[in-house]
């Protein structure tokens, strides 16, 4: 047996809003499912549809969705048949309509002292409290000889008479939510005393000393009074005109002039009317000054031929609202065609070479007029004035690869090397006319170079290979003062290179010949055992067939190196007492001694009074201080070595004695007492 | 993880107004109605209405038509809730909370919003 | 309005006792009727949906009952952590409203 384990049950929904109406059953065999409305399938659609065997609604529809919904399972195979308990939805809704006129059934007919009764065509469901506005002001029960019934939705006026008259509107609300009226509904009932407009003034743009007319008319019965009044309620009349109004005229007509109009005369003017009976009728116009900007300036603009371009003109700020056209060599341009005007915009259709050139955009109004150029290049594909070619470069000197092309706008080159794009630096420069030069050529820079020219219509590139022709020199040139140790082996290289491999060879500056000990291989100079004889001047000599010699020249200096004979220990001293470092150093030439404490050298000449540093070295420092305290280092150098040597200074306070203690008793640690 | 951020305490005086917001997080913010519901002290749970963040359409309970406004800003994943009018009796911890697809039940909760009415 | 009327105000079990919730509605409203726990100072939790489907994430111990105008909630064996006020609150009709809550407490 088919069994339903949930059923569908009547709910609410709302109009628009997603449902779901929900089925589950059980069988033994393969069930299938599937939704009756008002006994009829229910076909899914993207808004209705069925979601395993419950029906979900995307937006509930008052119309589509209203009616008896049934879930209904079948065995296809015995034929049994379920169907579930009838659900529905109880839709919320509210929908907008118009206010319209009931009674009397035409405007025509509506007079004073007859009933009106306008209808709130605002639906929904539940059904909707309505609320009722004249002139946006709510009414109520009862309120100035009118009936309201909200239930009914229809506002009656019994009797209606002119201070009924105005924009009536409806707002209704329900269990869905709020809706007012779609389109109002304007009553006139008309009073003959009551002050009617025949003519009102408009606002009113000038230029500076021209004129200006505001007419002004009301009709009613007797007639009715007009009066004009000006900003700050300053009444206009040819009797008493203000200061500023001086000449303003009031004709009989109820129009009102002002000559030579000044700034001080823009503004609001009223013109108001009042009849026997009824309210004041005030109507209003605004008296404005013509104006006009200036306009702001156009970017130079640069366009490929047979593209389609657009400049746009930006109207200056102006009253009344500047008129725009644009011109070209002193004609105005149409509005069609190849190059033409379309609203502010210059349309430049299918770019020619020859549409190059100064195009001026005007504005004008009242006020005046203004204009601004534009200046329009039309880009081209650069050509080859000279372009780069294989080149040999001497190391050492500037070399140059030029790239000449000429296209409008002026192209913009750049050099690439090695695919690597050349940025401008200390060594590479790339000129106006896109010539590169290399400052230093230096031997790496024999590679590939490319040259790409520029604009916005294409570019062009070629490339070139760079040759380096190498000079004659030393790698690296040798050191012209270099020190032997006594009595050791030592060695001076000198090597060089060139367009072809040099030979090098040593000898001495006097021009003796090398000692047997001393031999020259392939440009070393090997001592095997330094004596004092060895010491003077010697030359290298580099030299091929190509690029003839070069001559380095070399003092070798010999030296006995140094030693420290006395090294600085670690000391601690008391706080007040004398520090005493001792350092002593031999060596040939014989050491300079220097000290370095607290990461900074010592000058002898500026240690001031508590510092001292005697002629063997030693480093003596009275009255310590704990900021005493710290690394000091001795350094010993001779023109051919340097060494040095480091020991830390402690400063501590002195302990009072214990009585325990006996006046003999050492110190706890190694001190230097004074 | 989907997450409601419900603005910090609001202390105002009778007759102002006030707007508390309900930032959404870890899920897709226009799927899911929002739902806003208040709690006085002690008391059970008020359904106050819901938004649909795509359209921005507002179902109020009518009992605060006058009282609540909700809107939604798409573009932070935030729904908001103005009360205006406001006198003791709204003094209340108000939640926002998530909807399933259909907006019939409440599976996941902001933390509240506490509103205290005093002069 | 449809108004959800539970019973009783509190409630004062043992831990591992069975406890049950009643909550009655106004008028049929089939199983559309969804519970929640809130515990002191915190927001409330789904339990139970349409009168007895789970949600992920709550502990099996909770289960729910009913159709039409009758629903429960039972906890089959209550834990220290139960302690709470639990609402009844249905969908079926506009606009969706609550029971007025029944607090459990631990003996």
């Known amino acids: 047996a088919i069994v339903f384990i949930k059923q569908p049950s009547s709910q609410d929904a709302l109009q628009g809003r997603r449902a779901l109406l929900r089925c589950e059953v059980e069988a033994p065999g393969l069930v299938h499912v599937y939704w009756l409305l008002d006994g009829a399938p229910v076909q899914d659609t993207e808004r209705r549809f069925t979601q395993g065997s419950s029906l979900s609604f995307a937006a509930v529809d008052r119309l589509q969705d209203s009616g008896t919904f049934q879930c209904v399972a079948r065995d296809d195979v015995t034929g049994e048949e379920a169907r579930s308990a009838n659900a529905s939805f109880n839709i919320k809704w509210i929908e907008a309509g118009p206010v319209v006129l009931k009674h009397p059934a035409s405007e025509a007919e509506i007079q004073p002292q007859t009933q009106v009764t306008l209808r709130c065509h605002i639906d929904g469901h539940p059904r909707p409290t309505y609320q009722w506005f004249r002139d946006g002001t709510p009414l109520s029960d009862g309120q100035s000889n009118n009936t309201v019934s909200s239930k009914e939705r229809n506002l009656t006026l019994r009797p209606a008479g002119p201070e009924h008259s105005g924009l009536y509107s409806c707002c209704a609300h329900n269990a869905f939510g709020q809706a007012c009226s779609s389109q109002n509904f304007t009553l006139s009932i008309a009073d003959e005393s009551f002050a009617r407009v025949v003519l009102a003034p408009q606002d009113v743009i000038v230029a500076r000393n021209e004129e200006a007319m505001f007419h002004c008319q009301f009709s009613a019965q007797p007639p009715p009074n007009l009066q004009w009044l000006f900003e700050d309620e300053t009444p206009i009349t040819n009797r008493s005109r203000p200061p500023h109004l001086r000449r303003a005229t009031v004709f009989a007509n109820g129009s009102l002039l002002l000559t030579q109009v000044r700034p001080r005369n823009a503004g609001v003017y009223r013109c108001i009317g009042q009849g026997q009976r009824g309210p004041p009728v005030i109507l209003e116009a605004t008296l404005h000054l013509a104006e006009i900007e200036d306009m702001p300036l156009f970017e130079p603009r640069v366009f490929t031929a047979g593209s389609e371009e657009r400049v746009t003109c930006l109207p200056p700020k102006g009253l009344p609202e500047p008129s725009v056209w644009w011109e070209h060599a002193g004609v105005r341009l149409p509005t069609h065609g190849r190059v033409y005007q379309k609203g502010h915009e210059l349309v430049l259709a299918s770019i020619a070479e020859s549409d190059a050139g100064v195009y001026t955009c005007h504005a004008a109004n009242l006020a005046g007029q203004r204009r601004q150029d534009v200046n329009i290049t039309v880009a081209t594909v650069p050509t080859w004035l000279k372009k780069p070619q294989d080149s040999q470069l001497e190391e050492g000197k500037p070399g140059y690869l030029h790239c000449l092309t000429q296209a409008t706008p002026k192209p913009t080159v750049v050099w690439y090397r090695n695919q690597m794009l050349i940025s401008e630096d200390s060594r590479f420069e790339v000129f106006k006319n896109g010539t590169l030069r290399i400052n230093n050529v230096e031997v790496y820079d024999g590679t590939w170079y490319r040259c790409v020219s520029s604009t916005p219509a294409g570019s062009i590139e070629a490339q070139a290979r760079v040759q380096v022709l190498e000079k004659l020199k030393f790698t690296p040139p040798p050191q012209p003062q270099q020190c032997m140790e006594f009595d050791k082996e030592a060695t001076v290289p000198c090597s060089a290179t060139g367009r072809e491999k040099p030979t090098i060879k040593w000898e001495r500056a006097d021009g003796s010949s090398l000692p047997e000990w001393v031999t020259d291989n392939a440009g070393t100079l090997h001592f095997a055992r330094v004596t004092r004889d060895d010491a003077g001047n010697y030359t290298c000599i580099a030299s091929n067939g190509p690029q003839g010699q070069i001559r380095a020249h070399v003092q070798l200096t010999v030296a006995v190196f140094i030693t420290f004979k006395v090294e600085p220990e670690r000391t601690t001293v008391y706080q007040g007492h004398t520090a005493l470092l001792q350092c002593e150093a031999q060596g040939d030439p014989k050491p300079l001694i220097q000290w370095k404490g607290k990461d900074r050298i010592l000058d002898p000449t500026k240690l001031g009074p508590r510092m001292h540093i005697f002629q063997n070295g030693s480093l003596v420092i009275h009255d310590v201080a704990p900021e005493d305290s710290g690394r000091y280092t001795c350094i010993a150098g001779n023109s051919c070595n340097i060494k040095h040597t480091e020991a830390p200074l402690y400063v501590v306070d002195k302990p009072v004695p214990e009585e325990s203690e006996g006046p003999g008793s050492p110190p706890p640690y190694k001190m230097i007492q004074t | 993880e989907v997450q409601l951020l419900s603005s910090g305490p609001e202390l105002v005086t009778p007759g102002a107004s006030v707007k508390i917001s309900c930032k959404a997080s870890?899920?897709?913010?226009?799927?899911?109605?929002i739902n806003w519901l208040k709690q006085s002290h002690g008391k059970s749970l008020e359904w106050i209405g819901d938004?649909?963040?795509?359209?921005?359409?507002?179902v109020y309970n009518q009992k605060f038509m006058a009282k609540a406004t909700l809107t939604v800003d798409k573009t932070s994943n935030t729904a908001y809730m103005e009360l205006r009018s406001l006198t003791s009796e709204d003094s209340a911890v108000y939640y926002c909370?998530?909807?399933?697809?259909?907006?019939?039940?409440?599976?996941?909760w902001g933390q509240g919003t506490t509103l205290t009415v005093s002069s | 309005d449809i108004l959800l009327t539970q019973s009783p105000a509190i409630l004062s079990v043992s831990p591992g006792e069975r406890v049950s919730f009643s909550c009655r509605a106004s008028?049929?409203?089939?199983?559309?009727i969804h519970w929640y726990q809130q515990r002191t100072n915190g927001s409330p939790r789904l339990l139970i949906k349409?009168?007895?489907e789970s949600i992920s994430g709550i502990p099996s111990r909770f289960s729910g009952s009913g159709s039409g105008t009758d629903f429960a909630l039972t906890i089959n064996s209550v834990e220290s952590e139960d302690i709470a006020d639990y609402y009844c609150?249905?969908?079926?009709?506009?606009?969706?409203?609550f029971g007025g809550g029944t607090k459990l407490e631990i003996k």
């Open positions: 938004i649909n963040p795509n359209s921005g359409g507002p």
């Open positions: 609150q249905q969908s079926n009709n506009w606009p969706y409203t």
């Open positions: 008028q049929n409203i089939g199983t559309s």
């Open positions: 870890g899920y897709t913010f226009t799927d899911y109605y």
């Open positions: 909370a998530r909807g399933d697809y259909y907006g019939s039940n409440y599976n996941y």
């Open positions: 349409f009168a007895s």
